[in-house]
Interface confidence: medium
């Protein structure tokens, strides 16, 4: 079978998931694609405990997560229900602000410097976090 018991090399294991923290920036769509190319997805935050774990690793840096409303309603990239799920927005957010002068509103969610969430222009080159469930994650280091 394809079940895995450990995280890929240089990913961090936490509560049956594996996480990879970027050190460079990408637009949301590119970050989303990059996680998918790891057979993973942008991080989906489902609890306060997971929020604290991610926040601890990213520090006070704007960082994309797997939440967007580019097609209307807010959606998590893995299908987790947004309405009934965990949320940690900053006060007054999300506000779909149009005043940035970059065209359009704000359709992608990111962790802000204090860990709370904000919606922002999806083209901004923020860091990102990939997540994959542990029973899907590769257990062996790459062979070279």
């Amino acid at each position: 079978g394809s079940e895995r018991t450990c995280c890929p090399v240089n990913w961090v294991e936490h509560e049956r998931s594996c996480y990879w923290f970027s050190r460079s920036g990408k637009a949301w769509a590119d970050a989303d694609n990059y996680c998918r190319l790891e057979d993973a997805h942008l991080v989906v935050v489902t609890s306060w405990e997971e929020q604290k774990f991610v926040q601890h690793h990213i520090g006070p840096v704007n960082t994309w997560m797997g939440l967007h409303d580019q097609n209307g309603p807010w959606k998590w990239v893995d299908g987790t229900d947004y309405e009934t799920g965990f949320k940690n927005w900053r006060p007054e957010q999300p506000d779909d602000w149009y005043g940035h002068g970059l065209g359009g509103g704000e359709d992608c969610a990111h962790f802000t410097d204090d860990g709370r969430w904000n919606d922002d222009v999806c083209q901004r080159p923020y860091r990102w976090v990939c997540e994959t469930e542990l029973d899907k994650a590769s257990q062996e280091p790459p062979l070279l």
Epitope: K26, D30, Y34, L37, C130, S138, Q139, E140, P142
Partner: antibody, heavy 122, light 107 residues
Framework: QVQLQQSGAELARPGASVKLSCKAS????????INWVKQRTGQGLEWIGE????????FYNEKFKGKATLTADKSSTTAYMELRSLTSEDSAVYFC???????????????WGQGTTLTVSS | DIQMTQSPASLSVSVGETVTITCRIS??????LAWYQQKQGKSPHLLVY???NLADGVPSRFSGSGSGTQFSLKINSLQSEDFGSYYC?????????FGSGTKLEIK
């Protein structure tokens, strides 16, 4: 040792379809993506797409969407690429390659098949 | 899509010389670049990954350098078995484009 063994040369008619195979051995098949690369005679390398056998997730170069379909069979550790509506432009050598990975998202194609020559002619 | 400009297209050199092949990228790809060697009628062979790391079994006369948008592959003291074609390839999102190649020929 890691090996990618590709199927033999193919001769096909214009408009037909072909299915090329890439049999993987020597490593855990579901842990790595399999990529396909096209090379026309005397030309450079062109990335077609990638499949993750673990999840069957696929990624395609826009240029090859509708032309190539990637699949993988976990039980036989074999990846496949079907090419449809063949024309002379599809005549090329097609390589499969394993995408290795090091420290997070640094990728590279670390092992390659020997290539399959496809000739499209009437 | 990310554009790759590889130069020179061809190079005629003698055994023992040193050559440098460059790859210029249209946007910042950090260190997400690999180099391959391909001999006539054979599959490509990984030389360098993550811009600077030598793959297993690759002789130390090969070295990769660069980051961001400008990368180089240097071959010191060329040997007869080094002749062939060389390609760079980025891994900064799809499509994983290759450079157009550099053909290294014996003078």
């Amino acid at each position: 040792q890691v090996q990618l063994q590709q199927s033999g040369a193919e001769l096909a008619r214009p408009g037909a379809s072909v299915k090329l195979s890439c049999k993987a051995s020597g490593y855990t098949f579901t842990n790595y993506g399999i990529n396909w690369v096209k090379q026309r005679t005397g030309q450079g390398l062109e990335w077609i797409g990638e499949i993750f056998p673990r999840s069957d997730n696929t990624f395609y170069n826009e240029k090859f969407k509708g032309k190539a379909t990637l699949t993988a069979d976990k039980s036989s550790t074999t990846a496949y690429m079907e090419l449809r509506s063949l024309t002379s432009e599809d005549s090329a050598v097609y390589f499969c390659a394993r995408k290795g990975r090091d420290y997070g998202t640094s990728h590279y194609f670390d092992y390659w098949g020997q290539g399959t020559t496809l000739t499209v002619s009437s | 899509d990310i554009q790759m400009t590889q130069s020179p297209a061809s190079l005629s050199v003698s055994v023992g010389e040193t050559v440098t092949i460059t790859c210029r990228i249209s946007e910042n790809i950090y260190s997400n670049l690999a180099w391959y060697q391909q001999k006539q009628g054979k599959s490509p062979h990984l030389l360098v990954y993550a811009a600077i790391n030598l793959a297993d079994g690759v002789p130390s006369r090969f070295s990769g350098s660069g980051s961001g948008t400008q990368f180089s592959l240097k071959i010191n003291s060329l040997q007869s078995e080094d002749f062939g074609s060389y390609y760079c390839q980025h891994f900064w999102g799809t499509p994983f484009t290759f450079g157009s190649g550099t053909k290294l020929e014996i003078k």
